[in-house]
């Protein structure tokens, strides 16, 4: 099972949680690519970015994003943890001024342009299976994870623990 | 306030097996990874083993792999070390670590006081 | 599997100096690295994190610098308590422990 429990529990918490810090506690260049070594690419279609999952060519570059790892709080009356309730935020930028973000009301994942400070919408929760294999849990919607469907990124919503170890919700992070 | 507290250390014969135990209390446990670090006589900090929050992943050094064997219990907020073919080379104190952040493997954000394991004929 | 290499393995220094303490990597390791501060007969203390992240509750003549391969810890100013041995740590990919530096009043 992947490295996340009781996901439901959480949800108040995590929409409570609050990010201590206006600046990035580090930010970490990297490619993103799934679970079965697919590349996460950025395509500038129409003004606008478009995001495809797709298995790259032999030497063709991987996309870099810009990933900004910020503190978030725990209330201390929620998790019972006083100030050791910390989670890792994340956002994701792929170029410059543009942020993934997650739209609920379409389940999907998109590139917005906008300033900061970042809207709810551009944080994702780290969850980690270890350094190099991530989760990205919505801020704005507790137990929904960014994931691959139809070779697209999506949200999924993750129910239970037992479907926590789906690779359709786990990332590699590499710096080639 | 944070408190993990081990168990189980003591005088062993090669070959032999030992579990230890850590007790953790004041924050969720079911939320961090724990961890195992050891520290020979004398020595620095060698990292031993590690386990997801809910138990699902495990991650061992390569001198132990195969001999150690971490676990936890959720609802009763342990983790365990199973030691089995102890070595001369396994002696040491032995710390129970929680990581810095929920669901992350990231840092050692609190540590217990550590029990030792000694391991003579 | 990545290798830490701190230097030097013992460093003595006046109260008041400023010290540092370096740690290289085999790999870059995105300033995925912490410090651990042990003194004799206590269990290590996280200092630092992320490479230049303050724990909660530590001096503030204690920071942390770097990236890549090259890391440092610096104590700007001296004091008597800060007698112990320093570890940095990778978790960038798998977990490793530097061998320590012992930090010592002349």
């Known amino acids: 099972a992947f490295g996340i429990s009781g996901v439901q529990k959480y949800t108040r918490a995590l929409h409570d949680s609050s990010i201590t810090g206006i600046s990035p506690i580090t930010e970490y260049l990297a490619s993103l690519s799934t679970y079965n070594d697919q590349s996460i690419t950025f395509a500038l279609e129409d003004e606008s970015y478009e995001i495809y999952v797709e298995d790259l060519k032999k030497d063709e570059k991987k996309d870099k994003v810009l990933l900004s790892y910020y503190e978030s709080q725990h209330p201390s009356n929620e998790s019972g943890d006083g100030v050791d309730g910390k989670m890792l935020m994340v956002t994701l930028s792929p170029t410059k001024d543009f942020w993934l973000h997650a739209n609920n009301k379409e389940h999907s994942v998109e590139l917005h342009k906008c300033e900061k400070p970042l809207p709810d919408q551009a944080f994702f929760v780290l969850h980690n299976m270890h350094s190099n294999c991530v989760s990205f849990e919505c801020k704005t919607d507790p137990g929904v994870f960014i994931g691959v469907k139809d070779n697209h990124l999506a949200l999924i919503k993750v129910d239970s623990s037992e479907n926590l170890c789906t690779e359709n919700i786990l990332f590699k992070l590499s710096e080639t | 306030e944070v408190q993990l507290v081990e168990t189980g250390g003591g005088l062993v014969q090669p070959g032999r097996s030992l579990k230890l135990s850590c007790v953790a209390s004041g924050f969720t446990f079911s939320n961090y990874w724990m961890y195992w670090i050891r520290q020979a006589p004398g020595m620095g900090l060698e990292w031993v083993s590690s386990i997801n929050n809910d138990g699902g992943n495990t991650y061992y050094l390569d001198s132990v792999k195969g001999r150690f064997t971490i676990s936890r219990n959720n609802a009763e907020n342990t983790v365990y070390l199973q030691m089995n073919s102890l070595r001369s080379e396994d002696t040491a104190t032995y710390y129970c670590?929680?990581?810095?952040?929920?669901?992350?493997?990231?840092?050692?954000?609190?540590w217990g006081q550590g029990t030792l394991v000694t391991v003579s004929s | 599997d990545i290798q830490m290499t701190q230097s030097p393995s013992v460093l003595s220094a006046s109260v008041g100096d400023r010290v540092t303490l370096s740690c290289k990597a085999s790999h870059n390791i995105n300033k995925h690295l912490d410090w651990y501060q042990q003194k004799v007969g206590e269990a290590p203390k996280l200092l630092i994190y992320?490479?230049?992240n303050l724990q909660t509750g530590i001096p503030s003549r204690f920071s942390g610098s770097g990236s890549g391969t090259d890391y440092t810890l610096t104590i700007s100013s001296l004091q008597p308590e800060d007698v112990a041995t320093y570890f940095c740590?990778?978790?960038?990919?798998?977990?490793?422990f530097g061998q320590g530096t012992k930090v010592e009043i002349k």
């Open positions: 740590f990778q978790y960038n990919s798998g977990w490793t």
């Open positions: 670590a929680r990581g810095h952040y929920y669901y992350s493997s990231y840092s050692f954000g609190s």
């Open positions: 992320f490479t230049n």
